[in-house]
Structures are given as C-alpha cells and as structure tokens.
C-alpha cells in the first residue's frame, strides 16, 4: 500500500461504519423503551456532521454537541460504574447487574464502542485507510474527542456512590493518562458525589496482596479527597467468583471475601 494511503498512524474507519452506527441505534432504541423517541437517521446525521469534511486533527467537543443533544439520556445517577483498562469485566458485570450502567450501556457509548472513524478536510469521504493515532498524530481526533466528550458528561451526571473498576494486573492500576484519570475523575461533581469506590480486580489466582495499598491507588485517593469526595477501595481477588456471586448472591460461597 503506498504511503499516501497511510496518511495517519492509526487504523482507518471501521468497515461499514455508517451501517453499524445506524443498526446499533435501531437495536438500542428497540431494547430501551425510554429511548424509543430517538430518530436514528437524525442521530447518524449528527454523528456524521461531527467529523465529515473536517480535518481529523481539529475536532472539538463543540462538533459533537448536536449528537450529544440527540443522545441525551437519563440514567440513575447513583448506579454508575466507571472503568479503566478492564472494559470486558465491567460490561459483563452490568449485563448481570442490570440496574448499573457503564458508559457503553448508554446510547452514545453503545453506538461508538470499539469503533474507529475519521474523515478528511474538505471532502465528504470517510477515511477507511487510516485515522490519527492519539500519541503519534494528534489528540484532537474524532474518536478521542468523542470519548472525552461523552465521558465528561457521564461523570458530570453521577451522584451518591460512584463505582470504578480498575485493572490490578497493570503496572499503573490507576493511570492519570487514562480517560478515567484524565477526564472522569475531574468531572465528578463534589456537590452530588459522596463517595468514589474503587474495585481493584486481581489477575492472578494466588494474588492475595492488598492492591488498595498500591501507590497509584493512593494517588487516586489523594486526587479524590482534594476534590472533597470520599474514597473507598475494595480488592476483588476472584473476578470469576465475583461475577458468579452477582448472578447468584444466595450461593453459600458468596458470603466470604471475593
């Protein structure tokens, strides 16, 4: 492939991106009665309008405002689960614990989950060859700005006790550069949020360390405390058992520490 077809360092727009977004929207609005009023064609038009014909390194949160407006959704503010570097388990959890919500359980998060997209300046074409990489090319790209925008709004909506699932297998359990660390933490509203409770998910079966004492968790506690929000932390030593107990809380083995 010639270099001019690889203008950016990241992968190109996901194949059949328009069809995928539209199909996901239709599916979501069918499953969620409170969103049945949403016109999926208008949602796609607004999504498209955010990045088509725009330089993929000059995207702003403002570009996504029409989409944000159409995708406005009320989720129970005290049932929010944030996550960092452990998406799959977070999603498995909310699939079982149906009254809790990750960002990807909302319409806008569901539409964009695992997709890549970008356009080109001054043309109506979607770029299926390559899109900007956050590190190698630019941070103000369509995908990064989208997630920054929806993540900020999601965090701003949270209240009471907010939960966050963190990956205990990573060298930085709490990473200031993650979306959680750079956006969500700073947009929790102290006047609404009482406590941030971190669930640190252990990877190894024999790992009995208290990862709540990890320096990066202490750093998170410090940031949260300075924002006048209380902080608590729990080790989830056995994520498989944890999920099983969410499914079957009456199970006798679920009284011990997970």
């Amino acid at each position: 492939v010639p270099r001019w077809r690889q203008q950016w360092s990241g992968p190109g727009t996901t194949k059949r991106f328009p069809e995928t977004v539209l199909a996901r929207c239709v599916k979501y609005t069918e499953i969620h009665p409170e969103m049945r009023h949403v016109d999926c064609q208008s949602v796609w038009d607004a999504f498209k309008g955010a990045f088509i014909s725009k330089h993929p390194c000059n995207i702003t949160e403002e570009d996504y405002q029409p989409l944000m407006k159409l995708g406005t959704q009320t989720v129970p503010c005290n049932k929010i689960l944030l996550w960092s570097r452990i998406k799959d388990l977070a999603h498995q959890f909310t699939q079982v614990q149906r009254d809790m919500f990750t960002l990807e359980d909302t319409l806008l998060g569901y539409l964009a989950d695992d997709l890549t997209w970008c356009g080109e300046f001054n043309t109506s074409k979607i770029n299926y060859q390559s899109c900007p990489d956050w590190r190698k090319d630019c941070s103000n790209n369509p995908v990064s700005v989208f997630w920054k925008t929806v993540s900020r709004r999601f965090a701003e909506a949270a209240c009471d006790v907010v939960h966050v699932m963190l990956n205990g297998s990573r060298s930085k359990i709490f990473d200031k550069n993650s979306t959680f660390g750079s956006v969500e933490v700073h947009n929790l509203q102290p006047e609404k949020v009482q406590t941030l409770e971190a669930w640190v998910i252990h990877g190894g079966r024999e790992d009995s360390r208290d990862l709540c004492q990890d320096p990066t968790i202490k750093e998170l506690e410090s940031i949260i405390s300075k924002r006048n929000i209380q902080f608590s932390c729990k080790n989830i030593y056995r994520p498989d058992k944890f999920l099983q107990c969410v499914k079957n809380p009456e199970d006798s083995s679920c009284t011990s520490e997970i």
Partner: antibody, heavy 118, light 110 residues
C-alpha cells in the same frame, strides 16, 4: 530495467471510446500502483486516476468519473485505461506512470496520442 | 478540477539559481508531505526530479532541491545549466486518494 510501453496512436470520432494499454516489465507489476495522466496539446499535465494492479481497486478524478475505466491483466502485466463518450477536448497524449509509494511517478510510458476528430 | 498555481514562466542565466513556486491549499500541498516535481522536455515524457517534498531520486543532480512552507512548495535549481531548460510541474496528494498537478512553469535559460 523498468519499462512501461504504451499502445500506438489512435484517431477516434466524437462519442466513441478508446482503450489505451500500458505493458510493464522489469519489476513486479502487482507491487506498484499505476496512475494515468494526460496532456492536451500545449497544455499541462492532468491526473486521471489510479489502479491497484494487485486488487484491481481504482480511484478516478471527479472530472472523469463515469467516463473512465481502468483495468489490468496481471497475467500479461498490462494496465488499461478506457475513456468513453470522447469529445474533441479529450485530444491529448495519455501517459501511464508507476507510483513507487510516495505519490510520485518514477517511471512513465512513452505516451499515446489520442486524437478525437469528426 | 482544482489545480496548483505555478508561475507561467521563469528565466535565469547559466550558473544562477531560480525558484519555482507551487501554491495550493491546506487540502493538498499544505495538508500532506506528498509533493513531487517533474521536468518535461518538448515531446518527451515527464521525469521525476523531487518526491515527498524534498527527496531526490538517484541520478538527479543535487542542484535540484525541494522545500515546502505552509500551502506553498518550491523547486530550486542552483547553478543553472542549458539542459535545465524545460517545463516543470509540481504534483500533490489532495486527500481522498486523489492527486492534482500544477499549471506548469516554462524555464528559460538565457
């Protein structure tokens, strides 16, 4: 050595079609995109489009969309450019040119003069 | 069909330096590093002189150099020689898998 040899001059009537061939040798034909560029008498160069000889994928300049078709036959390492509904202002020398990857054209055919006249 | 703007003609004496400009927009020249330059003698096919803005193919004298600033690319020929007299064209990638040529410049060696 790399060579691109184009077919001979053509005289066509308005409304007709012309198909110009470009035979490649001296390199792996499927490894490089092939572009077509034309030049009207006394005028500048005009980019028409490209074909990926490996996949057969094409992209044409907006001006020629609907009138141009680029194809290839990998078995004989030859690219083709067909232009239909010819008009007198399509009179030009048509060049094929190899793209080594940087959006530049490092080897060119000798050019095929297509004259459109009634 | 958008084209890149070049001066119609440029001239210089042997040994002198000349510069040919090629002005586009942020959608082509300014947006990418895929600008090339071609020399064309009468009745001949064009010859690649500069690619990717400033790189020289083997066999092209180092008297030929390319540069870019904003939406304008430039070809500079130093130590002008009689055989440099020809037409020169710039070409740029223009996004969406398309390319655009310049209007062409006739170089006369006085």
């Amino acid at each position: 050595q790399v060579q691109l040899v184009e077919s001979g001059a053509e005289v066509k009537k308005p409304g007709a079609s012309v198909k110009v061939s470009c035979k490649a040798s001296g390199y792996t034909f499927t490894g490089y995109y092939m572009h077509w560029v034309r030049q009207a008498p006394g005028q500048g160069l005009e980019w028409m489009g490209w074909i990926n000889p490996n996949s057969g994928g094409t992209n044409y300049a907006q001006k020629f969309q609907g009138r141009v078709t680029m194809t290839r036959d990998t078995s004989i390492s030859t690219a083709y450019m067909e232009l239909s509904r010819l008009r007198s202002d399509d009179t030009a020398v048509y060049y094929c040119a190899r793209d080594p990857g940087g959006g530049d054209f490092d080897y060119w055919g000798q050019g095929t003069l297509v004259t459109v006249s009634s | 069909q958008p084209v890149l703007t070049q001066p119609a003609s440029v001239s210089g004496s042997p040994g002198q330096s000349i510069t040919i400009s090629c002005t586009g927009t942020s959608s082509d020249v300014g947006g990418y590093n895929f600008v090339s330059w071609y020399q064309q003698h009468p009745g001949k096919a064009p010859k690649l002189m500069i690619y990717e803005g400033s790189k020289r193919p083997s066999g092209v004298p180092d008297r030929f150099s390319g540069s870019k600033s904003g939406n304008t690319a430039s070809l500079t020929i130093s130590g002008l020689q009689a055989e440099d007299e020809a037409d020169y064209y710039c070409c740029s990638y223009a996004g969406s898998d398309t390319f655009v040529f310049g209007t062409g410049t006739k170089l006369t060696v006085l």
